[in-house]
């Protein structure tokens, strides 16, 4: 049998001005009952019964997953990273078979004297982490290697790693001009061919806060929007007081709905409230306006 | 890992001969590039001349062609250097230097392997 479950009321009214009763469950919508033991509840919206409550999926909560939340946790990544393949032609090495074995001493150690080398060529870039050689082919030395980049997750994330990737092709380009051979020597700590920097592809970090926030709030994806507070993201329903897209409900109470956020207006002994935002009183005894 | 010990530093008056040797343990290719570096009192490390084991390359500073000769013995994998005509300007504390790689870079930073050096005073 199904269970009765005690239904408490508070007397609000809607913003379209008719009165209304609001219980703690939803009688209005079909409810499946999961028994567990002796205890029994009406998950509703995907939600489920632990054998203590009702455990409710993003973005609803309340005894019986009724309820839509007011914002919804969105965690952008501490930090945001892009990675940038590079070819250059090292001239001051003729290239050995044993570069290709990236156990060998001979690897060992070009490898160290080349990520010495691209540490001096881009000191000045704070995004700067380091170098991965991908891969030494004859030619001199054709290095392939990636450049890596990152940075702590700002709005303009974007912006300042597309900056350092343009400060790292000004760089790489300048050194691989200005260290050349001489008389068929090198006077740097490596030098290299001009004509053998490329930059093959450029690969940063997709977050958008937006898009997150649009996914876990589900069939009300179109009511939640993000803010931002100290750099920091927020997925907020326009029910989530504080931010710029709140809802001033006055004397009334914002609900979620598919249709967006409304204003419940409350009555109270003296006055009922209407209007969009429940800022226009009633006074129960005289029936004229107070604004 | 690579080490390198020198020997054959000592005083010498102008017009002499002296001849340096390093011997290198720790390689594992009998392809790798050796060099002499020297440095006199107040200046900077400069390289003296470089070799590849293999006979691919060798190289002269100016100041020393025609009186220094840089030679490497494959079965004793030790490196010399043939100092002849010494002159005052040749006082330095001489180093032998090597890398894994067949290097052409006479910048002391791109040598990873060095000796403690050998002192060589060309005096009257």
């Known amino acids: 049998p199904l269970a009765t479950i005690p239904v408490s009321t508070t007397s609000l009214t809607s913003s379209e001005g008719s009165t209304i009763s609001t219980p703690s469950v939803d009688i209005s919508t079909p409810v499946t009952t999961s028994i567990v033991g002796d205890q029994c509840s009406r998950c509703k919206n995907g939600g489920f019964w632990d054998g203590l409550k009702c455990q409710c999926l993003t973005p609803y909560y309340g005894e019986s997953c009724e309820e839509v939340v007011n914002s919804i946790d969105i965690a952008p990544p501490e930090t945001v990273s892009a990675q940038m393949e590079l070819t250059v032609t090292v001239t001051s090495v003729k290239f050995t078979d044993e570069l290709k074995n990236h156990s060998s001493q001979e690897f060992r150690e070009f490898n160290k004297t080349f990520t010495e080398q691209m540490n001096i060529v881009y000191s000045g870039i704070p995004e700067y982490v380091g170098v991965n050689i991908t891969n030494l082919r004859l030619g001199s030395v054709v290095v392939e290697h990636d450049v890596l980049l990152r940075t702590k997750y700002t709005p303009e994330y974007k912006t300042a790693l597309d900056n350092a990737t343009e400060v790292v092709k000004q760089k790489i380009t300048k050194v691989t001009t200005e260290q050349i051979m001489t008389n068929d020597n090198c006077s740097a700590l490596m030098c290299f061919n001009t004509t053998g920097t490329q930059v093959q592809n450029i690969t940063v970090t997709q977050y958008d806060p937006v898009e997150e926030c649009r996914q876990k709030a589900e069939e009300y994806e179109d009511y939640f929007l993000v803010e931002y507070r100290d750099q920091k993201p927020y997925c907020i329903s326009p029910c989530e007081s504080g931010f710029n897209a709140s809802k001033n409900c006055n004397h009334g109470k914002c609900q979620m709905s598919q249709n967006g956020a409304r204003c419940l207006c409350v009555t109270t002994e003296t006055h009922w409230y209407s209007g969009e935002d429940c800022n226009q009183g009633t006074q129960k005894s005289h029936h004229h306006h107070h604004h | 890992e690579v080490q390198l010990v020198e020997s054959g530093g000592g005083v010498v008056q102008p017009g002499g001969s002296l001849r340096l040797s390093c011997a290198a343990s720790g390689y594992t290719s009998n392809r790798y590039s050796m060099a002499w570096f020297r440095q006199a009192p107040g200046k900077e490390r400069e390289v003296v001349a470089f070799?590849?084991?293999?006979?691919?390359?060798?190289y002269y500073a100016d100041s020393v062609k025609g009186r220094f000769t840089i030679s490497h013995d494959n079965s004793k994998n030790t490196l010399y250097l043939q100092m002849n005509s010494l002159r005052a300007e040749d006082t330095a504390v001489y180093y032998c230097?090597?890398?894994?790689?067949?290097?052409?870079?006479?910048?002391?930073?791109?040598?990873?392997?060095w000796g403690q050096g050998t002192m060589v005073t060309v005096s009257s």
């Open positions: 070799i590849w084991t293999d006979g691919g390359r060798t």
């Open positions: 230097a090597a890398s894994s790689l067949l290097l052409q870079t006479i910048n002391p930073r791109a040598w990873p392997y």
